[in-house]
Interface confidence: low
């Protein structure tokens, strides 16, 4: 078969399966004359042959774990022996079989974590090897945690790099490990080959024993501090402290107070600075937050509280400089006046805010001296003798002391003397007809005057006359302001009218006095008036539920995901169309009818979120009338942008020739969404070729390292590609160039011969 | 009766500065003292509040950075520094005495007018 099992003497590749017998010949070369015979040299293990007639084949099966590549030479000779053709080279590829198993490096593993330490934060790397090609199942490694011990309410603590072998925490881990409770676990690891996923896989196991150990990093118990402290300040309150010594503290005010009367030092120390003051402000809660050197927030921050203690240091006060009150000439012993209301700053419900009140003096002592007393503690003042007359003392003035347990204050109360109350008010009509209004209305609007009488004293409670709505307006959109000269009546709307729920209403007034009526004297017919409101109807435009509409979604949401819905109705009962209005990048859709609202395009929060659109309703029919509110799309963060540099780093120099190895830091990003923390990068080299040259070192989670490795380089450009990886969900890497020019210098800077402008490098190093 | 008197005011140039001042008939433990202004046709606003111990003061996001607020020579006596005076700084200022913040005024002064225009 001319072609596949022979023909002339050329350079050919053939692949073979490993461990298999030899089964059938490898190729059959053809002699061209003078060729009589040919030759097989290279690499043959004894296992490669030809025949003098040009028939490669080989003798036992072959092991790709002990050579995977033969290079072979055929040669053909001439009967003397003389090489006429070739040598030719011809390379076995062997192929690889799963038969090699994978077997961990150590048989037993050993490390430490501390409690509450971040989720997939790696704190262990377990390792397997397997001689089988790792370019094929054969030799691709899967790792699994076998058994957690001891394992609490079937919840795993620590989770598996399946493919790294990293060991970290889970979310539970990080919130329930507790040393106290349990200060080691154990895991059994397996590792098996063919990616997992075969039955026919290898596989091995070994041990990791995890010890726990504290986090010291917790917030402090709630700190009480009394006001006013006259001891020197600053006063230490409380700690905290970071796991390591180094940390650099600092506390943060979220509420951003004009002053901020606390410090933190080095230690870690919390101390208070000045005195503080209970009535200014009862409660501080600030935040301590750990860093490390380069300013990087070690963990999250620590929620500090810090109560103040009152001490008396506030007297009463009067509730204003004189307090009036009326009495009417009749009431009877024990009546109520009034009651008087003294304030203290001082905490509420304690002994430095519980106020006693003492009558002092009474002006004019007539009839007699001691005609009000006033209770102890509600400060209640009541009428203590007898009735009093109007035209013996119209007016009485009482000094009344209100004292806490430290202080005392002097208030004055006027209590006047006030003719009885044995008049009713009397409307001057009992119907005022029907008014007929428009359901829009302005609010504030008086439509009605209505007007009722009192014959007792004037100016007076008895004579005040104060106007109620007793029926007919249960929605109180309506209200009566009352003129304190004339008690004429004003009817105002206070709520929009609406047709649609109260078209007719039939409202009734009863007029009454602030004070109370003498026994015997009733309010009846003449205290009470009409009026029949007719409320018209204005077409309206449709009323959306909320201002807002808020919805929440991961932004890599497949198109046609729903994202959230709106509702309106209208007041007509009319139907409504939904748009949209103002989605400049086309990334929504409403449903006319139902108003739910899809996505239509991919959505990118990085591209700006919340993403906001406004949403109109419009009256299907009637005038087309609409309204407008507002959508808002909150877009949850997923990791889809890879790392890149945070500069254009173009210009970083070398002087040639090195005399010292040399170095430069820079500093990676990317766009997703980093909390508290920031971004944790992971930094290597982008291609194996460049170790012998270059090594790259993390400083912190966004900063790194390039080191040479040696002096010895050319003068001319180097362009070293550097691999970081987010290590986020799912981890995402970004390869990026570092173009590094080794030149020769002039006082530090590069020199180029005039005519080799182009790309002068413009930052040494 | 106790009464608060204002003074100073007057007709000033935008960008100009000018000084308020009051003083009440009688000295206010543990009350607070402050300024209020009323445009034609409007409520009063609050502009300025000083706490009865001089200690800490209390401003509208209107004047805050331009007016300051602070202490006269009296325990009873507040004054209001009021600096780069706008058109809209026009009106009617009043003197108050509050206990327990802006909210709750006992007693008001006569008011003085401030015009700001060139």
């Known amino acids: 078969q001319e072609g596949k099992f022979s023909g002339p003497l050329k350079p050919m590749t053939f692949s073979i399966y490993e461990g298999q017998e030899p089964s059938q010949i490898i190729f059959q070369f053809k002699a061209n004359p003078p060729a009589v015979t040919f030759e097989l040299t290279g690499e043959t293990d004894n296992i490669f042959v030809i025949e003098r007639e040009g028939l490669l084949y080989y003798n036992r099966a072959l092991d790709r774990e002990t050579r995977s590549t033969h290079n072979l030479q055929v040669a053909a000779l001439d009967a003397n022996g003389i090489i006429v053709e070739g040598p030719v080279p011809i390379t076995i590829k062997v192929k690889d079989i799963n038969d090699n198993r994978p077997t961990f490096l150590q048989s037993k593993y050993e490390g430490s974590v501390r409690q509450n330490s971040r989720p997939g934060k790696p704190f262990l790397y377990v390792n397997a090897t397997d001689l089988d090609d790792p370019a094929t199942p054969n030799g691709q490694l899967y790792y699994q945690i076998v058994i957690q011990l001891p394992m609490i309410n079937n919840v795993m603590y620590f989770q598996i790099n399946n493919k790294t072998g990293a060991i970290s925490l889970t979310r539970e881990g990080s919130q329930e490990l507790n040393p106290a409770k349990n200060p080691s676990y154990n895991l059994v690891i397996s590792v098996k080959d063919m990616g997992g996923q075969s039955e026919n896989s290898f596989s091995d196991t070994t041990s990791v024993d995890i010890i726990v150990t504290e986090n010291i990093w917790k917030a402090p118990k709630p700190v009480e501090m009394v006001e006013n402290s006259t001891d020197p300040h600053p006063i230490k309150i409380t700690q905290v402290r970071w796991n390591d010594p180094g940390a650099q503290y600092s506390l943060v005010d979220k509420e951003k107070l004009p002053r901020f009367p606390f410090s933190i030092d080095q230690e870690g120390d919390i101390y208070v600075t000045q005195p503080l003051d209970r009535e200014e402000k009862d409660a501080y809660v600030f935040y301590a937050v750990a860093k490390d050197e380069y300013g990087k927030p070690l963990s999250y921050p620590l929620e500090i509280h810090v109560k103040v203690k009152d001490i008396n240091d506030n007297p009463p006060t009067c509730p204003s400089p004189v307090t009036v009150f009326e009495v009417q000439e009749n009431e009877r012993l024990g009546n109520s006046i009034g009651t008087l209301t003294a304030h203290d700053r001082d905490e509420e419900n304690t002994a430095n805010s519980f106020l006693n009140y003492r009558i002092v003096e009474q002006t004019p002592k007539l009839p007699m001296d001691g005609l009000f007393l006033i209770q102890t503690y509600a400060g209640m003042l009541q009428l203590a003798k007898q009735s009093l007359k109007k035209q013996d003392t119209p007016q009485y003035n009482l000094t009344i002391e209100v004292s806490d347990k430290d202080f005392k204050t002097l208030c004055f109360v006027q209590i006047n003397v006030i003719d009885i109350n044995d008049q009713i008010p009397i409307f001057e009509k009992s119907d005022y007809g029907n008014l007929t209004l428009a359901e829009d209305t302005n609010i504030g609007s008086t439509i009605l005057t209505i007007q009722a009488t009192d014959a007792d004293e004037p100016f007076t409670g008895s004579s005040k006359i104060l106007y109620h709505i007793i029926k007919g307006d249960s929605e109180g959109r309506l209200g009566v302001d009352t003129d304190p000269h004339t008690n004429t009546g004003y009817v105002i709307i206070k709520k929009p009218l609406d047709f649609e729920t109260a078209a007719v209403s039939n409202i009734v007034f009863k007029a009454e006095n602030p004070e109370p009526l003498v026994f015997g004297v009733k309010y009846n017919a003449s205290s009470f008036a009409k009026f029949t409101l007719i409320v018209t109807d204005v077409n309206e435009a449709p009323q959306f539920s909320q201002h807002v509409f808020q919805a929440k979604v991961s932004e890599d949401v497949a198109i046609g995901t729903k994202v959230g819905n709106v509702t309106a109705k209208d007041p007509e009962g009319l139907d409504i169309s939904y748009s949209l209005r103002g989605d400049t990048r086309g990334w929504l859709k409403i449903d006319h009818v139902t108003g739910e609202i899809f996505s239509v395009a991919p959505l990118d929060r990085e591209a700006g979120s919340p993403y906001r659109v406004q949403v109109v309703a419009t009256e299907v029919g009637g005038s087309s009338l609409s309204s407008v509110s507002e959508f808002h799309l909150i877009l949850m963060d997923v990791n889809d942008n890879p790392p890149r540099l945070a500069k254009d780093y173009t210009g970083l120099f070398f002087c040639h020739p090195l005399s010292a190895p040399g170095s430069l830091i820079f500093e990676a990003t990317d766009d997703d969404q980093h909390l508290f923390r920031g971004p944790h990068f992971t930094f290597s080299l982008g291609s194996g070729s460049l170790q012998n040259d270059w090594e790259v070192s993390k400083i912190n989670g966004t900063h790194a390292r390039l080191s040479t490795r040696h002096t010895e380089f050319e003068e001319r450009e180097y362009v070293v590609l550097i691999r970081i990886n987010d290590g986020g969900r799912p981890p995402l890497e970004g390869i990026v160039s570092l173009p590094v020019t080794f030149c020769s210098c002039v006082e530090g800077s590069c020199f180029r011969p005039a005519g080799h402008q182009t790309g002068i490098p413009t930052v040494g190093m | 009766q106790v009464q608060l008197q204002e003074s100073g005011g007057g007709l000033v140039q935008p960008g100009g500065s000018t000084r308020l001042s009051c003083v009440s008939s009688?000295?206010?433990?543990?009350?607070?003292m402050g300024w209020f202004r009323q445009y034609p046709g409007k409520e009063r606003e609050f502009v300025a509040l000083l706490s009865w111990r001089g200690n800490y003061a209390e401003y509208s996001d209107s004047v805050m950075g331009r007016f300051v607020v602070s202490r006269g020579n009296t325990q009873n006596s507040v004054n209001l520094q009021m600096n780069n005076l706008k058109p809209e700084d026009t009106g009617i200022y009043y003197c108050?005495?509050?206990?327990?913040?802006?909210?709750?005024?006992?007693?008001w002064g006569q008011g003085t007018q401030v015009t700001v225009s060139s």
């Open positions: 108050a005495v509050t206990y327990g913040g802006a909210r709750s005024v006992r007693l």
């Open positions: 009688r000295t206010f433990s543990y009350y607070d």
